[in-house]
Structure formats: C-alpha cells, structure tokens
Interface confidence: low
C-alpha cells in the first residue's frame, strides 16, 4: 500500500455567483482508516464545510458515494455560490482515534475565487478645458471584477496610447477588485472630433473587451484667430468693417464693438459655420457712418471666448481731410 497523498488538482477555481462549484479531492490510499473532512482556511479558526458522519450541510453534496467500500474520491459540490464562499478549501484526512480523530494529512488546497465581470468602464475627462499643446488627463474606472488579473489599454482615435498609469485595488486578497487608470493626452488643434477609448480585457469577457469612451470636445478649447478688414467706402460715406473670428471651439463666444472706447454693439455668436475639424467660424459686420466724423475713429472689436479674458483687435478708420473740413464747417 503506497503512502497516502491527498490530491487536489485545481489550485484555483473560478466560480460565478449563483453557480455550483466542484472541489475535487482524491486519495491514493485507503489507509490509515479514518474520515476525510473539508475545511475552508487553516489553523484553529478554520470552518468545517463538510463532514460525512455528522452535521447538516444543505448546500453540499458529494460527487461519489462515500459509503462505497473502496471509495477514493472525496470531491464535493457546493451549490448557489455567494461572495461569502470565497476562500481556500482543504480536504483533510483524519486518522481514526480515541477519544477523537486526529488530523493526519491535508491536501494542498483549492482556492475558490469569484469569477465576476468588470463593470462597463467609465471614462471621465478633465474638470476644465485646455488649449492645444497642453496635456490633459482622462480617468477610466471599472469595478466588481474577479480574479484580479486584468488588462487595460488606452486608445486615441484607434491608436494605442502609452502614457498612462494603472492601479488595481485592493493589493491583497479580495472578493472583487477595481481598476483605475489615468491617461495623459497632448491636445492638438484638430482634436475637437477626437475620442479617447479605455479598453478592459478580463478572463470573464471571453476575448470581448469592454470599452468606455470620452470625447476630446469636452476637454479642449481652441482659441479663435481674429481678423478685421475694412471694406471700400460706399455711397453715403459708409464704411463696412468685417470682423472674422476663425477656428474656435466651443461655440460660446461674445463679441463687443467699441467706437473710440464706447460700446456700440454687443452680440453673441449665433449663425456659425462649422469647419471639417469641428471648430467654428463666425463673421460680424459693422457699418460706420463717417460723414459726421470729425476725427479718426478707433474701432475696437472685443472677443470673449468660453469665459476667457477678452481679446481686442483695433482698427483706425481715417477720416479724410475734406471730411474734417466739412465737419468743422458744420460745427460753426
């Protein structure tokens, strides 16, 4: 008769909540005489899971008939697994003794870990917008998964990113785990239509990773480029001043016209032209009547974009000497 070995072939058993778990245990010898019991954990505080001879274990059934004379299979099945069932299970051989049985040999143990899918990744962007060439951070969070091994990748417009940091918590044993990853993305002027994607792969997903996305449009501010032009004189001494605000995002923009420092009109961008890259253009006109102007007119256009400090662009409208004479005549 060979020396007794307690064989628990699975080191790790992954089980989903509600499923049944089969814990395998076979022995290589019928001797010494005595029962095989199942415990969760080790030491004095270990929990009895199954004892064929005594006790009531409604969720536990044996795989084989333990009453059979030459039975060497002591595997058990636990039904309706809950998170509380996680732990390492040992089949333990006891030597029959008096007044009580004495522990003889333990199997190496099977760790039962819950197999739980990660939640859909949630990607959040920065609290405030940033301008191109600045770096912004995106955070991806997923939780509730087990086992702990998980792979997370970041993509921008389908291209894999490398500048990110990932943490899985907790570090030690747990019923389930969560992952948090922060990616750093350098903004480009054309990123209004860009998207970042967080991709999570886990053993429970059977090769079909979960994805969460965020639009860079929520994180970027593209400041406008400003251009002011003066159209040729019209009949009736009118000048058409055109103010072009180009390539800005978001569309929240306010424009104020000042004539010699005095506000003459304020307007909020409404009829915008959208560019291919997602930025906007807007044109504003001001008709200035120069017939009653005695001195040169300083026209200032003040643009306030997305709550930022106003940007000014000025134009000096020169009044001709002839007009100045006429104007001075009129004042006499």
């Amino acid at each position: 008769e060979e020396e007794l070995q307690m064989i628990q072939p699975e080191k790790l058993l992954l089980v989903a909540v509600g499923e049944s778990a089969t814990l395998n245990c076979t022995v290589t010898s019928l001797l010494p005489v005595g029962p095989v019991l199942w415990f969760r954990g080790v030491g004095p505080g270990r929990e009895l899971i199954y004892n064929q001879k005594e006790g009531h274990f409604p969720r536990v059934t044996t795989v084989s008939d333990l009453t059979k004379r030459n039975n060497m299979d002591f595997s058990i099945r636990i039904s309706s697994i809950t998170p509380a069932d996680a732990g390492t299970y040992y089949c333990v051989k006891f030597r029959k003794g008096s007044p009580e049985n004495v522990e003889f040999k333990s199997g190496p143990g099977t760790e039962m870990a819950l197999r739980a899918k990660p939640s859909a990744p949630v990607v959040s962007g920065p609290a405030a917008r940033a301008t191109p060439e600045h770096t912004v951070s995106f955070t991806c969070k997923s939780h509730g998964f087990s086992p702990r091994d998980i792979t997370l990748k970041w993509f921008k417009n389908g291209n894999e990113l490398s500048d990110f940091q990932t943490n899985v918590d907790p570090a030690g044993q747990s019923v389930s785990y969560s992952i948090r990853s922060t990616a750093r993305v350098v903004l480009a002027p054309w990123d209004v239509r860009s998207q970042v994607t967080c991709e999570v792969a886990h053993v429970t997903l059977q090769g079909d990773p979960l994805r969460g996305t965020a639009n860079l449009s929520e994180a970027i501010r593209v400041p406008p480029t400003l251009e002011v032009t003066q159209q040729p004189m019209r009949a009736g001494n009118q000048v058409n001043i055109t103010y072009q605000v180009r390539n800005f995002y978001p569309q929240n923009l306010q424009l104020t016209w000042l004539e010699n420092g005095n506000v003459c009109r304020t307007e909020t961008a409404s009829t915008l032209t959208e560019n291919k890259d997602g930025t906007y253009n807007w044109t504003s006109w001001l008709l200035v009547n120069t017939s009653d102007q005695r001195d040169d007119v300083v026209l200032t256009c003040q643009v306030k974009h997305d709550g930022q400090l106003a940007v000014n662009k000025s134009l000096v409208l020169e009044v001709s000497a002839h007009q100045k004479d006429q104007s001075s005549d009129a004042t006499h």
Epitope: K11, P108, G109, E111, R148, D149, V203
Partner: antibody
Framework: QVQLVQSGAEVKKPGASVKVSCKAS????????FSWVRQAPGQGLEWMGW????????GYAQKFQGRVTMTRDTSTSTVYMELSSLRSEDTAVYYC???????????WGQGTLVTVSS | EIVMTQSPATLSVSPGERATLSCRAS??????LAWYQQKPGQAPRLLIY???TRATGIPARFSGSGSGTEFTLTISSLQSEDFAVYYC?????????FGQGTRLEIK
C-alpha cells in the same frame, strides 16, 4: 530585486539522494509558492512539484511521488528539494522558480546541475 | 494531466521578420497560459502570462493570443537577441505542464 540563488553542482551515484537548496532574497518569502522544474540535457522543462513556504503544503507531480521531498526554512528564506533513489535519467539541471499568483514563474534560480553516474 | 504540444519544433526566420509559434493544450486551460524564453546556459525567462499580458520589461514586439486549447506567441520583428528556445506552460490545473519547446533559429 528578487534573486533566487541555488546551491552548486552535484555528482551522485545511482541509488543515492541529492538535496538542492534555493535561497530567496529581495521579496517576501512567505507570500509566494515555489516550484521545482528540471531539464535533462538537450530536453524540455519538466515540473516536479511545488511548496508553500507559509503553510508547508506541498504538491508533487505523479512521476516524482515518493521520491521527491520539498521543504523550507523560513528563518533563512530557503527552500529545498530532495530527490532520492537517483538513477542516470535524473541527470539534469534543477531549477527553483517563484510562483506568481500560484500560477506562472516570474523568477528563476540559476540552476543546479545534478549528474548521476556510477 | 494536460499535455502541451508546441509547433513547429524548429522555426527558421530571418532577422526583422515575424515569427509565429503555436501551442496546443490537450484540454481547455482557459487563458491560464504562460510563455518563456530560454537561451543556452541560462534559466528560462517569463515573457507572457495570462495568454497575452507581457511580463515586466518585455518589449512590445512580443505578443500572445488564443484561449481554450489554441495559443500563439508572435514576435513582430525579430531581433538578434530573440533567437532562443520558447516554451509554453499551462497553469489551469496541477500538474503544471510545459510544451516540448520551439527552437527559433536564424535563417
């Protein structure tokens, strides 16, 4: 940096026993399991068994049952593998390897050549 | 026990080219598969675990895929230091078992 340093080469006669040691440094010894893997000259890798330094639990491949014993000394962070009843086909390089997540081997010792010859 | 079979036994590839190594399990090991590289006179070195996760310090040219019984190790652009013997190992069930190895040699 984790390091596993094994004992030196051994020459043994058939029927004798050999005990190879593996000293771990740079990590928490009791947190990880250790396996022993051997490689006969010009051959592949063969897993022999594992042991848990914390509990002393062991598990051996069926082929080595009854001939192999794995023990540990937690005070020196050393694991041992003893193979008895040596035969010429036991000539191999014996590696100790640290188990990560009780699964794959992330650190390996440099190997110990055991030659069994009469 | 689960038997791991690697193919081909020897693979001849030119530097800069792609190498594809296969590993088959006699029964499903889910994604519990690791790959190792071994050079002459050295201990094996962990490359990939969990089928596709690169170990610390392993270059991105190494990638793993597969699940169940069929697995692949791909080296996208072979460097001179990549010519070695490669082993797969399953850890879904004891005893842990290795494939017999694929020798990657310079063409």
């Amino acid at each position: 940096q984790v390091q596993l340093v094994q004992s030196g080469a051994e020459v043994k006669k058939p029927g004798a026993s050999v005990k190879v040691s593996c000293k771990a440094s740079g990590g928490t010894f009791s947190n990880y399991g250790f396996s022993w893997v051997r490689q006969a000259p010009g051959q592949g890798l063969e897993w022999m068994g594992w042991m848990s330094p914390s509990s002393g639990n062991t598990g051996y491949a069926q082929k080595f049952q009854g001939r192999v014993t794995m023990t540990r000394d937690t005070s020196t962070s050393t694991v041992y593998m003893e193979l008895s009843s040596l035969r010429s086909e036991d000539t191999a390089v014996y590696y100790c390897a640290r188990e990560r997540s009780g699964s794959y081997f992330d650190y390996w010792g440099q190997g110990t050549l055991v030659t069994v010859s009469s | 026990e689960i038997v791991m079979t690697q193919s081909p036994a020897t693979l001849s590839v030119s530097p800069g080219e792609r190498a594809t190594l296969s590993c088959r399990a006699s029964q499903s090991v889910s994604s519990y598969l690791a790959w190792y590289q071994q050079k002459p006179g050295q201990a094996p070195r962990l490359l990939i675990y969990g089928t596709s996760t690169r170990a610390t310090g392993i270059p991105a040219r190494f990638s793993g895929s597969g699940s169940g019984t069929e697995f692949t190790l791909t080296i996208s652009s072979l460097q001179s230091e990549d010519f070695a013997v490669y082993y797969c190992q399953q850890y879904g069930s004891l005893p842990f078992t290795f494939g017999q190895g694929t020798r990657l040699e310079i063409k």
